[in-house]
């Protein structure tokens, strides 16, 4: 699997999409997990509804939500109020029994909010939305890492 990079702005919401073959993964629950180290395990963050037929219902764990379009074949993960510690490697997974198939490998990059460096005195800042439904989702910038490309090049 290639790794797809999704970039979001600190404090905003980032939407990650994982397309898959809906028939190949028919009847399968999905999950979003965080990769712990290069060879480490992938730690489950959130998974879709226990009843596959209800996978379209949004489930959340803290600031992360997941929903699955099982007919269209798109798993969507929303990371709300993105923070620097959210940056890292993740996976979208398809679950069966104790096995997990990787649908997509994802690198989340968190960009500094360009507004942070201005005088915010005259700016209207909306109150933080209480629900995912009301949250503003910034369209993410995504690209695939080229083969051999280092995600975080060493700084000189």
């Amino acid at each position: 699997h290639n790794t797809t990079v999704f970039q979001g702005v600190e404090g905003q919401s980032l939407q990650v999409s994982c397309p898959y073959d809906s028939m190949k993964h028919w009847g399968r629950r999905k999950a979003w997990c965080r990769q712990l180290g290069e060879k480490g395990p992938c730690q489950r963050v959130v998974s879709t509804h226990n009843l596959w037929l209800l996978s379209f219902l949004r489930r959340r764990n803290g600031s992360t939500a997941i929903t699955d379009d099982t007919l269209g074949g798109t798993l969507t993960i929303t990371l709300r109020n993105l923070q620097p510690h959210d940056a890292g490697f993740y996976q979208c997974q398809s679950l069966h029994g104790s096995e997990a198939d990787t649908l997509r490998k994802v690198l989340v990059e968190v960009l500094a909010d360009p507004l942070d460096h201005r005088d915010a005195g005259d700016l209207w800042v909306p109150g933080e939305s209480e629900s995912f439904e009301d949250a503003h989702v910034e369209h993410s910038i995504s690209r695939s890492l080229l083969e051999g490309e280092i995600p975080f090049p060493p700084t000189s």
């Epitope: 073959d21 028939m23 190949k24 993964h25 028919w26 009847g27 399968r28 009843l51 596959w52 037929l53 069966h96 029994g97 104790s98 096995e99």
Partner: antibody, heavy 121, light 107 residues
């Protein structure tokens, strides 16, 4: 009507190569996994591996990894099981089966009639 | 790899009687268990999947109880066409594994 039709019986010598086939009809061949199961004479069933013809994603049971190759040609709705160098211990009946996935569990719901492979010098 | 064991190896039953077949897994397979029937010279036939769901066309005399590591297939009243070998299959963990089978023959 869903059908899996396998190629005919084969008699081979040790060291020879072989490819047997399993042709699906009556359903969308690219939308279901196809598994291969071995049954040695007078013995039980052994899971060999599985392929998803839609994208040729293939998984092998560790016991069969490197011993056989599973492939599929979706243009003719056919899955294959092949050996590059047969051994006498490969003598067995080989079945292909369709795996149907669903909310209540997975099921090998349709099976081919089996292909008997005999390897003898 | 999960090891499946079946008991007894052979079960001798008279037609009309009840047959009880056991399948045990070396670790939990949740409800990811199927049962197959195989007659001599034929391909296996799916009976039960998802631990307890009967496949299309399978009569109600076939039922399964249990989940996790212990499962029981019960044939409430054996008919002549039920004398065969029965296999359980787990596909909770890779690779999927079959039990060695239970032969049900006529007493």
């Amino acid at each position: 009507e869903v059908q899996l039709v396998q190629s005919g019986a084969e008699v081979k010598k040790p060291g020879e190569s072989l490819m047997i086939s399993c042709k699906g009809s009556g359903y969308s061949f690219t939308s279901y996994w196809i598994g291969w199961v071995r049954q040695m004479p007078g013995k039980g069933l052994e899971w060999m591996g599985i392929i998803y013809p839609g994208d040729s994603d293939t998984r092998y049971s560790p016991s069969f990894q490197g011993q056989v190759t599973i492939s599929a040609d979706k243009s003719i709705s056919t899955a294959y099981l092949q050996w590059s160098s047969l051994k006498a211990s490969d003598t067995a009946m080989y079945f292909c089966a369709r795996r149907r996935q669903g909310i209540w569990g997975d099921a090998l719901d349709f099976w081919g009639q089996g292909t008997l492979v005999t390897v003898s010098s | 790899e999960i090891v499946m064991t079946q008991s007894p190896a052979t079960l001798s039953v008279s037609p009309g009687e009840r047959a009880t077949l056991s399948c045990r897994a070396s670790q939990s397979v949740s409800s990811n268990l199927a049962w197959f029937q195989q007659k001599p010279g034929q391909a296996p036939r799916l009976l039960i999947y998802g631990a307890s769901t009967r496949a299309t066309g399978i009569p109600a005399r076939f039922s399964v109880s249990g989940s996790g590591t212990e499962f029981t297939l019960t044939i409430s009243s054996l008919q002549s066409e039920d004398f065969a070998v029965y296999y359980c299959l787990q596909d909770n963990n890779w690779p999927p594994t079959f039990g060695p089978g239970t032969k049900v023959d006529i007493k």
